[in-house]
């Protein structure tokens, strides 16, 4: 993908609401291309934050502050809702409502959209077409919460056109404006070092690389040209910078560390692959 | 700034059809709802319909009957039209464009519609 | 459909004069009510959306509260201009009402 983010692409905003107890409430609120967060919600001021010098995509002032307007009713809104029914639902303080909405994209083309709720960390309701259904599994609960929910047909609508226009709209405005930065190349790092032992006479090989992107990246233990099928990739994680950084380990015996190497690909290496090779490694970190 | 002309038909006979287009100038078409509201002489207003640029349509139950609203995105227009008026459907006709949240920041200067035998 | 109740149908002010007018909803709308000015022979003009947010270009001595079902219009100190027809309306489910409208007449 030329854009340096893997298909299908996502834009879609998370609201996460703690109620603590009946009057005390706390919500935070960001919006997300794909895993990179491009905006925030500040409760205070009750505004969008941009948090990338791109993040305001094609939209105009007007359309921006009309979403700030609408998101502040409808938080203002879902609380009081919630806190009303939170009896009548039986839910208990503390308790914690995600809501993740938004749509994907797929070969330039919009391929569906999205808005869920979950109770607790588990699935509770979600909107398909112009209504709010209950997950089988969650039971009278959900079922009720949807009865709430559509009261408002009007309200509905609108989430409809957000999800099915609005939002489909923006993402392409959005990785239109953020092309530039989206679709640039860096170099990952690369060193190696011991991990902690995993026991008597053995070693944990740790190939560290970092400050890559976009994210794709391929990184293997090797013996010669031999893949190391024992090689622990963890998570991808995330740097300040918009970079991201990998581990991979091997846990070898100590005698058979001496001819591996660690081989990184990366999209910004253009085929010319980094490898770092074990016995060249100074024994210090 | 955005700005909205209605054009059409000033007098009409009972059981005629009202037509009326209004005219979309500057601004964007796209993400709005586009809404034709009345007010008869001397009294309140009252909304007819609207409909969403991409062409899903909502009606006052009171005339959904009667009432058609259409949009033509190459044109930046959308339309109106009342069927089998009476003299209860004279009252001038305003074109207005809402955001979301259904207020409406954007008219027409209005045009009065006389229905009259 | 929600009714909107406005009162008073009509009053009398002298400029500088501070004015309040209050619209009520026969049922909770919110924070989705949205107030406009008409002068005759005019459209009307959005003063206040969302209970209280100003609208572009519309000066600060105009001002709105409330939420639920009581809603209040102030002009913290009334101008020549002002002397007008003031609606609210609410946008909280469809079809959007207005109130009959409050006639502001100079004293």
């Known amino acids: 993908n030329a854009d340096g983010l893997k298909e299908p692409l996502s834009f879609h905003v998370t609201w996460i609401a703690s109620f603590y107890n009946h009057s005390w409430k706390q919500n935070l609120v960001s919006g997300w291309l794909s895993d990179l967060q491009t905006h925030t919600w500040d409760s205070n001021s009750s505004t969008i934050v941009f948090l990338c010098p791109w993040s305001r995509g094609n939209f105009s002032n007007e359309e921006w502050k009309e979403l700030e307007t609408l998101f502040r009713i409808r938080t203002i809104r879902s609380f009081e809702g919630i806190r009303r029914y939170a009896h009548e639902l039986q839910f208990e303080y503390p308790f914690e409502i995600q809501v993740t909405g938004g749509c994907e994209l797929h070969s330039g083309k919009v391929s569906g959209s999205f808005l869920q709720l979950a109770y607790q960390g588990s699935d509770f309701v979600s909107f398909q077409n112009n209504s709010w259904l209950p997950y089988p599994v969650a039971g009278n609960m959900a079922k009720h919460f949807c009865k709430v929910l559509n009261q408002n047909q009007h309200e509905n609508d609108i989430t409809h056109n957000l999800l099915s226009d609005t939002c489909p709209r923006f993402i392409l405005g959005l990785l239109d404006a953020g092309k530039a930065h989206l679709q640039r190349q860096v170099k990952p790092e690369a060193w190696l070092s011991h991990g902690p032992s995993p026991g008597p006479g053995h070693l944990q090989l740790v190939c560290h690389v970092s400050g890559f992107y976009p994210k794709p990246v391929w990184v293997m233990w090797m013996r010669g040209e031999q893949e190391q099928q024992g090689t622990q990739r963890g998570d991808i994680l995330p740097s300040a910078d918009g970079t991201w950084y990998l581990r991979a380990t091997l846990e070898v015996a100590a005698g058979e560390a001496a001819d591996l190497s660690c081989r990184v690909k990366h999209s910004s290496l253009e085929g010319q692959d980094i490898v770092l090779y074990w016995e060249h490694h100074s024994s210090v970190g | 700034q955005v700005q909205l002309q209605e054009s059409g038909a000033g007098l009409l006979k009972p059981s005629e059809t009202l037509s009326l287009t209004c005219a979309v100038y500057g601004g964007s078409f796209s993400g709005y709802y586009w809404s034709w509201i009345r007010q008869p002489p001397g009294k309140g207003l009252e909304w007819i319909g609207y409909?969403?640029?991409?062409?899903?349509?909502n009606y006052n139950p009171s005339l959904k009957s009667r009432v058609t609203i259409s949009v033509d995105t190459s044109k930046n227009q959308f339309s109106l039209k009342l069927s089998s008026v009476t003299a209860a459907d004279t009252a001038v006709y305003y074109c207005a464009k809402a955001p979301y949240m259904m207020y409406f920041d954007s008219w027409g200067q209005g045009t009065l519609v006389t229905v009259s035998s | 459909d929600i009714q909107m109740t406005q009162s008073p149908s009509s009053l009398s002010a002298s400029v500088g004069d501070r004015v309040t007018i209050t619209c009520r909803a026969s049922q909770s709308i919110s924070s989705y009510l949205n107030w406009y000015q008409q002068k005759p022979g005019k459209a009307p003009k959005l003063l206040i959306y969302a209970a209280s947010s100003l609208q572009s270009g519309v000066p600060s001595r105009f001002s709105g509260s409330g939420s639920g079902t009581d809603f209040t219009l102030t002009i913290s100190s009334l101008q020549p201009e002002d002397f007008a027809t003031y609606y609210c309306?609410?946008?909280?489910?469809?079809?959007?009402?207005f109130g009959q409208g409050t006639k502001v007449e100079i004293k």
């Open positions: 409909i969403y640029y991409s062409g899903s349509t």
């Open positions: 309306q609410q946008s909280y489910s469809t079809p959007p009402t």
